[in-house]
Structure formats: structure tokens, C-alpha cells
């Protein structure tokens, strides 16, 4: 049902859904801190623009009695319950910042007449693609998929002279929310990734993964997985690995690889790590002081959601336009705004663009080094290290099919 919005006469409210089920197990207090820090900045920016208005946030908590798994499994109903709560209280703001679980976002989008924008820190799954009033501030699965296809096809770099068309995907069901949807997208038979590959098999058991590492009859040399180095070690241990195996470890929200004193463990030598270009580990604001890198990215997305709303509010107010209109609801896309950690670019569908970085372990220095970067906005790869000190023969990535190329 239509809910009146607290969004006019110089007073603009943000509805923040504080859900017990969340993409990352983050204390809600930290998210509140991020939102409040964002509000201070937005108020200052509006004042600087000569706009004398009030901006506040209302935090909407669920009772947590029914939906208390803490992860995203029971988030679908929690999101709808919160919306019902907002509806009953007639307390809808100009914008909804909140659901981070793909399940809840998808269902809320489906079950409501959204005449207001929805900003999500998460909602990684393909089912949340191409939603007209949804903005996602953490890299969704579609962006990962496009990188992988681009990289698989690349064959004109000094260190990659073969196009690839095959892959194994390791997915055992214990993944974090981001990894779950990233791998889900790769697994889906109708996805762009599956469409572009000639062979793709999902490995669901540890033993399947372990067997492939030395199986002479394997159908691909490339294995994609998602998680951190410790996750890989638990699975792989110190097992021998065929020399033409390439493991692609997707670990987007982790900038530990860029820290000065980090040495790559030996088991990472056959691994290419895909992560995001680092911000700074110097984030020292009240909300980020005690956060792990992943959780900092999550809290940062909440803060940037507030800054994005402030950016759009400022534009509409300066142009004398109404905020409670479909035009405003559909405007949170195809733009760049000044985020907390630098410029943030949203694509035509409201999804954040970023620079992905592919790292390798240097056999000389045992350090992680940047092999290439990929700009999701233009779907383009930029080689960085033209002479990588790889573990693979001739310092080239092997062919993806055993028995061909440098072995």
C-alpha cells in the first residue's frame, strides 16, 4: 500500500532498516555510527550549498523473535515485516537504506510498489540485477561475471596467450553471503559466464576439489573459488598441485594483500587472487576503527548510501524539483558522487563500479603483486606487470586444457 513519506517542507528523512539477518555479521551499532557520520557530512554539504533543510535518519529494528538466524536464510520475511512496520507507523522516509540480503531485497522489491529509492549494501545476486529503483553499493555478482569472461577470453598479454573456455567452480554451501551469490551466478546455467564457457563443472565436496589438483584426466586446469587464503588452506593444505593448475581465489572485500608486511604463504603460489583496489587501511573514523576489512567495506557502503542520498537531494532541491516523485526514485544511477573514500560511480542500473585487481604471488619475493586491473565501468582489462615472476612455466599462464600450451 502507498505510505506517506516524511519527505517535504524542508524536512527529509532516511529510513534505515536495521535487520537482524544481514550479509555480514556486523553489530548494528557500527552501522548506526556509519549512518550518523554520513548524516553529519550531508548536513554540512547541504549547508555549504545554501540549502537550509533538515536531514535525519529513522532506524527501523525488527523484533528479532522470529527471524534470528543472523545470516540471510530467514531474511525474506524479516524485510517484509519491517516494511509492514513502516506502513503501520506511516513512517516512510524519502529513501530506504537497508536490506543487504539478496533474498530480502528481491522480495521487498517484488512485493511493494516502490515509488521511493532503495539503497543496498549487498544484494549481490543476479536476481537483484536491473531493478529500476535499487542501488547497490557493493560489487554485485554481475560485475564479477563480466570480469571473468573478459579475462577468460584475453589472449594477447605477454603472460596470457591462450583464451580459456573451461573452468571448475568450487562451491560447498558454507560460503559467506557475498561468495554464495558470486558462485551462484557462475553456477547458474543461464548466466553470461555459463553461456560463454564450453565446459564448467561445480565441485561440491572437499574431496572432489582435492582430487582435481592431481587428476591427469581433469577437463580444466582452472578452478574458481571464493574466500580468503585460510579458507583455501583448510581445503588444500600442503597437497601437491599439478604445475598447470590455476586457482582463481575471489576475495573482493579484503585488502590485507596490500599491507606492507604481508608475505604470501607457499600454498598461494598457484593462486591468482581477485580483490578490489584498496582504499586505505588508515580509515580512522569512529565507525571503522575496530572493523575487519570486509566489515569496513560493509559499513562504508552504509555511509556512502547516506552520502548518495545527500547528493541526489542537493541536486533536486537546487533544481526546485519534488523529492516524492518517480523521477527522484529512478535517479540514483548513471552518476558519480564524492563518497567517503573517494569518488563512487554508479552504472546505468545503479550498481557500483570499481577497479578489480588480480594478484599473483611472486616466486622471487613471496609478496602479492598486481598482475592486472579491471575497470568494471568500461569492462576493460589493464595489464600492470608485463614480466610477472610466476610459478607457471615460462612466466605465462597455462592453457586451460591439459596437454596443450606451456606445461
Amino acid at each position: 500500500s502507498q505510505v506517506s513519506q516524511n519527505c517535504h517542507n524542508g524536512s527529509y528523512e532516511i529510513s534505515v532498516l536495521m535487520m537482524g539477518n544481514s550479509a555480514f555479521a556486523e553489530p548494528l551499532k557500527n552501522l548506526e555510527d556509519a549512518v550518523n557520520e554520513g548524516l553529519e557530512i550531508v548536513r554540512g554539504r547541504l549547508q555549504n550549498a545554501g540549502l537550509n533543510v533538515t536531514v535525519n535518519a529513522t532506524f527501523m529494528y525488527s523484533d528479532g523473535l522470529i527471524h534470528n538466524s543472523g545470516d540471510c536464510r530467514s531474511s525474506t520475511c524479516e524485510g517484509l515485516d519491517l516494511l509492514r512496520k513502516i506502513s503501520n507507523a506511516q513512517r516512510m522516509g524519502c529513501v530506504l537504506i537497508g536490506p543487504s540480503c539478496t533474498y530480502s531485497t528481491f522480495q521487498m522489491y517484488l512485493d511493494t510498489e516502490l515509488s521511493y529509492p532503495m539503497i543496498s549494501a549487498g544484494s549481490f545476486g543476479l536476481s537483484c540485477d536491473y531493478k529500476e529503483t535499487l542501488t547497490r553499493l557493493m560489487s554485485p555478482a554481475r560485475k564479477l561475471m563480466y570480469f571473468l569472461v573478459n579475462f577468460w577470453k584475453t589472449n594477447d598479454l605477454p603472460f596470457k596467450t591462450y583464451s580459456w573456455s573451461t573452468s571448475y567452480v568450487y562451491k560447498n554451501g558454507t560460503e559467506t553471503e557475498d561468495c554464495f551469490w558470486y558462485l551462484n551466478a557462475l553456477e547458474a546455467s543461464v548466466s553470461y559466464f555459463s553461456h560463454e564457457l564450453g565446459f564448467k563443472v561445480v565441485l561440491r565436496q572437499d574431496k572432489e576439489f582435492q582430487d582435481i589438483l592431481m587428476d591427469h584426466n581433469r577437463k580444466s586446469n582452472v578452478i574458481i573459488m571464493c574466500g580468503g587464503p585460510e579458507f583455501l588452506y583448510k581445503l588444500k593444505g600442503d597437497r601437491a598441485v599439478a604445475e598447470d593448475i590455476v586457482i582463481i581465489l575471489v576475495d573482493l572485500f579484503n585488502d590485507q594483500y596490500f599491507e606492507d608486511n604481508v608475505t604470501a604463504p607457499d600454498y598461494m603460489k598457484n593462486v591468482l587472487v581477485l580483490t578490489l583496489s584498496p582504499g586505505n587501511s588508515l580509515l580512522n573514523s569512529s565507525f571503522s576503527r575496530n572493523l575487519s576489512p570486509t566489515k569496513r567495506d560493509f559499513a562504508l557502503a552504509y555511509l556512502n548510501g547516506i552520502l548518495l542520498f545527500g547528493h541526489m537531494l542537493k541536486i533536486f532541491l537546487e533544481n526546485g524539483e519534488n523529492i516524492t516523485t518517480p523521477k527522484f526514485a529512478h535517479a540514483f544511477r548513471n552518476l558519480t558522487f564524492e563518497g567517503y573514500d573517494g569518488p563512487v560511480t554508479l552504472d546505468d542500473w545503479g550498481d557500483v563500479d570499481s577497479t578489480m585487481v588480480l594478484l599473483y604471488t611472486s616466486v622471487d619475493t613471496k609478496k602479492y603483486k598486481v598482475l592486472l586491473t579491471y575497470d568494471t565501468h568500461v569492462n576493460k582489462t589493464y595489464p600492470v606487470d608485463m614480466s610477472p615472476t610466476f610459478t607457471w612455466k615460462n612466466s605465462k599462464l597455462p592453457n586451460d586444457i591439459t596437454g596443450r600450451g606451456p606445461q
Epitope: 557530512i41 554540512g44 586505505n280 580512522n284 569518488p343
Partner: nanobody, 119 residues
Framework: QVQLVESGGGLVQPGGSLRLSCTSS????????MDWYRQAPGKQREIVAT???????TYSDAVKGRFTISRDNAKDTVYLQMNSLKPEDTAVYYC?????????????WGQGTQVTVSS
Amino acid sequence: QVQLVESGGGLVQPGGSLRLSCTSSSNIFRIYGMDWYRQAPGKQREIVATIYLSGRTTYSDAVKGRFTISRDNAKDTVYLQMNSLKPEDTAVYYCNAGEPTASSVRQYWGQGTQVTVSS
């Protein structure tokens, strides 16, 4: 109207150091990032360093490892510490703050401070 005032420029020998300051009449450094630019005689104005709200910093290749940008919110001041100065660092240095415009430069400029590196 936001005012930015640079100071700290001067004449210095190659290899020497200077610290530039940019002070604001408002809280602009607490709500937007800030850039230092420089313009050498007969050349285009070029970006030198940026500091964002989070404290994240970026530098042009020409100054990386030699210059450090920092901020003191309590004093509404941003600094540019310049070490190992070279003759090619000679330029007028400007601070640029506020909301980025369509051309990526920010709203407000200071009047500039001259840095001359010469023996």
C-alpha cells in the same frame, strides 16, 4: 563564501623540504575531499595530491614517495609536506576544495603560494 588560504611557499635548494598549509574559513575539509594542484610557468595546472574524508590519499607519479598530504580537522587545515625537492617542482601551488564539478576540479580555489627550487 568559502575562502582557502595557502602558505608555506618559498625558495629552497634541491633536496630540501617545505611544508605548505591550506587553511579554510569553514568546515569544508570535513565534508569533502581536498586536492593540491600546481602550475609551472607556461604549463598546464596539474594535480599533485588528494586526501579524501576517510584519510585515503593519492599522489601523482611525479611526487609519489616524496610528498605527503595530511589533514588536521580541528584546525580546518590541510598540509602538503614536500621532501627531496627538485627544480622541476618549481610552481605555484594551489589548494582546491569542495564539491567536484563536472570537470572534476572542486568548487573553491586558494590564491596560490609560490615554491621555487633552485641552487
